[in-house]
């Protein structure tokens, strides 16, 4: 019944959050990504 749907919704939310985290991890902002190399490169 309703309990099953609620559980499924929570489960889907967790999966979506994990997917979002994975995407954010891969596609970091240029500013953040630059921190992993010579940080002053390209800075004003």
């Amino acid at each position: 019944g309703g309990g099953g749907s609620k559980h499924k919704c929570v489960q889907n939310s967790l999966v979506n959050n994990e997917t979002l985290e994975s995407i954010m991890n891969t596609l970091e902002s240029e500013e953040d990504f630059r921190k992993y190399f010579y940080y002053l490169e390209g800075s004003k």
Partner: antibody, heavy 118, light 112 residues
Framework: QVQVVESGGGVVQPGRSLRLSCAAS????????MHWVRQAPGKGLEWVTV????????NYADSVKGRFTISRDNSKNTLYLQMNSLRAEDTAMYYC???????????WGQGTMVTVSS | DIVMTQTPLSSPVTLGQPASISCRSS???????????LSWLQQRPGQPPRLLIY???NRFSGVPDRFSGSGAGTDFTLKISRVEADDVGVYYC?????????FGPGTKVDIK
Amino acid sequence: QVQVVESGGGVVQPGRSLRLSCAASGFTFSNYGMHWVRQAPGKGLEWVTVISYDGSNKNYADSVKGRFTISRDNSKNTLYLQMNSLRAEDTAMYYCARGGSGFAFDIWGQGTMVTVSS
Amino acid sequence: DIVMTQTPLSSPVTLGQPASISCRSSQSLVRSDGNTYLSWLQQRPGQPPRLLIYKISNRFSGVPDRFSGSGAGTDFTLKISRVEADDVGVYYCMQTTQFPFTFGPGTKVDIK
């Protein structure tokens, strides 16, 4: 001259821990992201982890996530790799590399060998 | 993960002759800033890796102009115009466009 020197390798039993160090000199350490790359005997190169210039951002390969921790002390110009729950497949030469201009690994150390064996 | 492949895996060459190594990525290495972060590394026997080329075609300081890089998108090439004895070793392409950073399997260059 610009260089990085790794230390701390050795023979360790599976499940145990080890901490590697990388001492940097000849450049402004705090301006550079730093990486660890490993190479199993007779095999190719595998990127392991990176830490941002200020230590605020870190990223790990899936193969070491949750077991290895990268850190740095900019006041000591030193990079660290804490390796826990070591496995036989972690046996490798571990290289410290500087993340330089052009998003390339421009300075490499001579490496320190880690052997995980019972 | 971006998978890097190299061909050939072994390349016996004649001293003074050219050599060419191909590298292909499983997806485009063009980053949102418009740059392509593909580099080439040389590893001589018993030595650590050494940077040769970054951003496809830029030679790192101290690298002889016998080495050149080219390519775009997913296909890249390292050329040695005239192979010298010092060039023996394994050559790796590497991408730093996207985490996790990945290397090609390496191409072993030796003298015939």
